[in-house]
């Protein structure tokens, strides 16, 4: 694959991943009410990083923002921070990579400057992707912990009517935003790696020495050091690796409620 193609593809993949990170951060469905093996309710609860929502079977949806900073769990704050760091680094990465693209000519910028910028943007995309993946994974871990805790206390609060009153705890499971976040983080990371690989192809090559003639025992023997060709892999017959994005569907694709649980 040519340097330009690798750099361009890396940029596009990172851009898609970055858009996904923004989408995941804004989505309300980071955690959704667990519907499996649960008393069936006519309301569906789901939560995001910024607000929690309830959708009734009437179709009426009400969302409430978390209008507090101090009252929120530290883990949620950490996830927010990681996602925002991912977005900020992504924005900087995109801006830098636009100027670094080989197909765009800006003034008298030489290849070594473009190579440095490509490497910088690649590193930024890698950190951005890792930040998003860590953020989503921390949230997922938090969900798993809470899920099993609430499963253990599934029916709590035996008070009221002679110990017969049951309080059903709402259990939460992975929402669509987690999958969007993982895929997006992965794409941003892959795009960043591709940018870093492209940087190596843009760097002026010092390892390609010209053929030198040596005079030994009156014979002219020309040594062609073909084996010292720069081992970037570009221009060689390296196979093109395709990246498959399974795509992430949001929960609201089936907003008309019914699936396994056709109860909301």
């Amino acid at each position: 694959m040519s340097v330009t193609a690798c750099q361009g593809l890396g940029f596009v993949v990172s851009l898609i991943g970055f858009a996904g990170i923004i989408a995941a951060t804004c989505m309300d469905q980071w955690s959704t009410q667990d519907l499996y093996n649960n008393p069936v309710t006519a309301v569906f609860n789901y939560q995001g990083l910024w607000r929690s929502c309830v959708r009734e079977s009437s179709g009426f949806t009400e969302c409430r923002g978390y209008f507090t900073l101090l009252g929120l769990p530290a883990m949620l704050q950490a996830v927010r921070a990681l996602m925002i760091v991912g977005i900020v680094l992504g924005v900087i990465g995109i801006l830098v990579s636009i100027f670094a693209l080989k197909c765009i000519r800006i003034g008298s910028m030489d290849d070594s400057a473009k190579a440095k910028m490509t490497l910088t943007s690649g590193i930024l995309f890698i950190i951005s992707g890792i930040s998003a993946i860590i953020g989503v994974s921390v949230f997922a871990n938090m969900l798993v912990t809470n899920f099993w805790m609430s499963t253990a206390n599934m029916y709590s609060g035996m008070g009221g009517m002679g110990g017969m009153v049951q309080t059903v705890q709402t259990r939460y499971t992975f929402g669509a935003a987690l999958f969007v976040g993982w895929v997006a983080g992965g794409l941003t990371l892959i795009g960043g790696v591709m940018m870093c690989i492209a940087c190596r192809g843009l760097t002026p090559d010092d390892s390609n020495f010209k053929a030198v003639s040596y005079h030994a025992s009156g014979q002219n023997v020309a040594y062609r050091p073909g084996g010292f060709k720069a081992s970037t892999g570009f221009g060689s017959n390296t196979r093109n690796k395709k990246i498959y994005d399974g795509g992430a569907r949001t929960e609201d694709d089936e907003q008309s409620h019914p699936t396994k649980y056709d109860y909301v």
Epitope: A42, S58, G59, F60, P258
Partner: antibody, heavy 118, light 113 residues
Framework: QVQLQQPGTELVKPGASVKLSCKAS????????MHWVKQRPGQGLEWIGN????????NHNEKFKSKATLTVDKSSSTAYMQLSSLTSEDSAVYYC???????????WGHGTLVTVSA | DVVMTQSPSSLTVTAGEKVTMSCKSS????????????LTWYQQKPGQPPKLLLY???TRESGVPDRFTGSGSGTDFTLTISSVQAEDLAVYYC?????????FGSGTKLEIK
């Protein structure tokens, strides 16, 4: 405004089946669950089940699972409930009502009185 | 299934009096997501279909007189009529509108002296 038209009465023989209709107008029929409620003469209300007109997804009260079959016809904005193997216990007024805020039932049909008699 | 228990089963009052009726559920009807209680009150007059009075335990449906108020949370709910009128003669039902299957209470019959 929301209107739900139900036939006034249905006289059926024991063991037979009857298909009750509920024609809706004044709102987007396919967007809201349609509920069915039974009321025996002088008795309280019993929830039978509901159906979502957009895809036919339904929920049933276990008590009526083998008794009532809920269907819809989107083209005519009509919900149906078929009652099978009728006995005197099935003699009642059957209401249809679409879901509303708070999962409540704000609009009710006038009800169909089903009389099971030989 | 959620059991809804209404008391008393009947009440006889004079016009202008204040009336309270109770409804208890076997499971909490409070949704943690929005802190709303999914309990509904209906009024049914003889020969008519039920009429929605209150949803979310205390939200009055439009057109319902403000003498009707709902209160309570979790499992214990109350319907209060501040000053009973002759037209309030009816049976009042509470309904669980949170868990499937939806269930109704057996009703409280309000009679006017």
């Amino acid at each position: 405004q929301v209107q739900l038209q139900q036939p006034g009465t249905e006289l059926v023989k024991p063991g037979a089946s009857v298909k009750l209709s509920c024609k809706a107008s004044g709102y987007t029929f396919t967007s809201y669950w349609m509920h069915w409620v039974k009321q025996r003469p002088g008795q309280g209300l019993e929830w039978i089940g509901n159906i979502h007109p957009s895809n036919g997804g339904s929920n049933h009260n276990e008590k009526f699972k083998s008794k009532a079959t809920l269907t819809v016809d989107k083209s005519s904005s009509t919900a149906y409930m078929q009652l099978s193997s009728l006995t005197s216990e099935d003699s009642a007024v059957y209401y249809c009502a679409p879901i509303y805020y708070g999962n409540s039932l704000a609009y009710w049909g006038h009800g169909t009185l089903v009389t099971v008699s030989a | 299934d959620v059991v809804m228990t209404q008391s008393p089963s009947s009440l006889t009052v004079t016009a202008g009096e204040k009336v309270t009726m109770s409804c208890k559920s076997s499971q909490s009807l409070l949704n943690s997501g929005n802190q709303k209680n999914y309990l509904t009150w209906y009024q049914q007059k003889p020969g008519q279909p039920p009429k929605l009075l209150l949803y979310w335990a205390s939200t009055r449906e439009s057109g319902v007189p403000d003498r009707f108020t709902g209160s309570g949370s979790g499992t214990d709910f109350t319907l209060t009529i501040s000053s009973v009128q002759a037209e309030d003669l009816a049976v009042y039902y509470c309904q669980n509108s949170y868990f499937y299957p939806f269930t109704f209470g057996s009703g409280t019959k309000l009679e006017i002296k």
